[in-house]
């Protein structure tokens, strides 16, 4: 079939309306003016355009903007963002919290997409740093994103974002990158009392050093198994009996249900069985009576 | 909860008419473009008809332009379908339907559907 | 445009993976829906854009593919999934359904 270029009589669009549902393919790029398509760019969201008359609408805004959207433009894609690619995304400049958001809502029931994987790398970059409105806005659609972002990444986090951070958001966070969270959460959190505190910092205890934990021992805190089995291994390892009793409390009681299970198996390997069996738990595995710990690691460190 | 109510369905002979009525409750009624889809007995669907929020735009099947016509009322929540010259491959169930659109255009929920038979 | 479902009816056991396809005529993209219906029922989406989930769907229900050939894979057939599924195109209008696949009981 020869493509039809000229636009019928009395077809030619004067606004973006429902009526150009109805036109084939051929008929929208003929019959509709690119320049109005832009200007009017609110109003597709509304009519239920078929994903080829899609395409054909993101045609039209490509050749009038070869060089990337304006951000007046891209504020108002609606579902036709859904249509662009990281390509499309790289060659724009969006500055606006509003546009961002107004583009994720878009999203909003998908994955996140290699399309608001670059857009939010754009908006991140244009901005310098992860600022707490858009941290927030960015865990608002996509809780999983802070686990998303390199240790590198998370470094520009300033400390004052860390408000913005709900436990679910650290789901799947490896330790590598709560290693960068917890400092940030420790001073971002530093004025506020004992159990509010520990509140707060809880989720971000998988990057905690070991001297924080021997604090927090003394504070009551009673800390549950769930937070305690993420803790880093190398910094449950130093703490005494005592102090993993004062940590846990009442919690305390759990450690038997996971004694196969780091960090509590190394940790049970490091204690003396007679200081295990003042928990009065059963649990197994601990340095026999009379022997001595030598801590090669130490010697090595002095020599 | 979101739901579609149908009604209206019947025995007809070929050539009368009929009309169907779709109550929607649950949901912003006047927000949603609307459908009529059909199942002939034993047979696959077959999008006959939708209208738009505000009923300025129509659309139609070729197998029922002409004869049927879409209608709603936003006032009463109602979806309508008159079907006149009705003939026997009309014979099926008639279902109402929301249409979704966010990008794509997909339809949730159905109604439960009214018989619609033409027969002598 | 015209879709094309295969196979037009299957026997499967509870527990087993099922893989129902669909053609399309022409390339659409990832414009493409599944509905579930069961005998009397109307029907019910599944799954949007080719692949995304419906929410409130079980996840053994997933869909994949784009432009021509798309499939709904059910990973492990439950009591409840015996019902007919039907593919729906939404690239260009008029919008179009497939043929149906028939899950019974083997």
């Known amino acids: 079939e020869v493509e039809k270029t000229a636009c019928p009589s009395g077809k030619k669009a004067r606004e973006i309306d429902e009526s150009l549902i109805f036109y084939k393919k051929w008929e929208l790029e003929a019959c509709v003016d690119a320049a109005l398509l832009a200007t009017q760019m609110d109003r597709v969201n509304a009519i239920p355009f078929t994903y080829e008359q899609l395409d054909v609408l993101k045609h039209k805004l490509d050749e009038l903007y070869p060089q990337g959207y304006p951000e007046s433009v891209i504020q108002h894609l609606g579902y036709l963002f859904l249509k662009m690619s990281p390509e499309d995304i790289r060659k724009w400049n969006v500055t606006s919290l509003e546009t961002l958001k107004a583009l994720l809502e878009v999203n909003k029931g998908h994955e996140m997409s290699p399309q608001v994987a670059t857009l939010i790398d754009r908006f991140v970059k244009g901005r310098g740093q992860l600022d707490k409105d858009t941290l927030d806005t960015l865990t608002a659609f996509y809780p999983g994103y802070l686990c998303s972002l390199s240790p590198e990444e998370l470094s520009s986090v300033p400390p004052s974002s860390i408000w913005a951070v709900r436990p679910q958001d650290l789901d799947t966070c490896d330790p590598r990158q709560l290693d960068v969270l917890y400092p940030k959460a420790r001073l971002a959190f530093q004025n506020m009392n004992g159990s509010e505190y520990f509140v707060k910092i809880q989720s971000f205890l998988g990057g905690a050093p070991t001297e924080d934990l021997k604090a927090l021992s003394q504070q009551n805190v009673s800390m549950d198994l769930a937070t305690f089995m993420k803790l880093r291994t190398d910094a449950v390892l130093p703490l005494t009996v005592a102090e993993v009793q004062k940590l846990l409390g009442p919690h305390v009681e759990g450690l038997k249900a996971e004694e196969r299970h780091r960090p509590v198996r190394d940790w049970i390997l490091r204690q003396r069985q007679d200081d295990l069996d003042t928990l009065g738990l059963g649990l197994q595995g601990g340095i026999p009576n009379g022997y001595l710990v030598l801590d090669l690691s130490m010697q090595e460190a002095l020599s | 909860q979101v739901q579609l109510v149908e009604s209206g369905g019947g025995l007809v002979k070929p050539g009368g008419s009929l009309r169907l009525s779709c109550a929607a409750s649950?949901?912003?009624?006047?927000?949603?473009?609307m459908s009529w889809i059909r199942q002939a007995p034993g047979k696959g669907l077959e999008w006959v008809s939708y209208?738009?929020?505000?009923?300025?735009?129509?659309y139609y099947a070729d197998s029922v332009k002409g004869r049927f016509t879409i209608s709603r009322d936003n006032a009463k929540n109602s979806l309508y379908l008159q079907m006149n010259s009705l003939r026997a491959e009309d014979t099926a169930v008639y279902y109402c339907?929301?249409?979704?659109?966010?990008?794509?255009?997909?339809?949730?929920?159905w109604g439960q559907g009214t018989l619609v038979t033409v027969s002598s | 445009i015209q879709l094309t479902q295969s196979p037009s009816s299957l026997s499967a056991s509870v527990g087993d993976r099922v893989t129902i396809t669909c053609r399309a005529s022409?390339?659409?993209?990832?414009?493409l829906a599944w509905y579930q219906q069961k005998p009397g029922k109307a029907p019910k989406l599944l799954i949007y854009?080719?692949?995304s989930l419906e929410s409130g769907v079980p996840s053994r229900f997933s869909g994949s593919g784009s432009g021509t050939d798309f499939t709904l894979t059910i990973s492990s057939l439950q009591p409840e999934d015996f019902a007919t599924y039907y593919c729906?195109?939404?690239?260009?209008?008029?919008?179009?359904f497939g043929g149906g696949t028939k899950v019974e009981i083997k």
């Open positions: 339907a929301r249409n979704i659109y966010m990008g794509g255009i997909w339809f949730d929920p």
């Open positions: 649950g949901f912003t009624f006047s927000d949603y473009y």
């Open positions: 209208i738009s929020s505000s009923g300025s735009t129509i």
């Open positions: 022409q390339g659409i993209s990832s414009a």
């Open positions: 854009d080719a692949s």
């Open positions: 729906q195109q939404f690239n260009s209008y008029p919008l179009t």
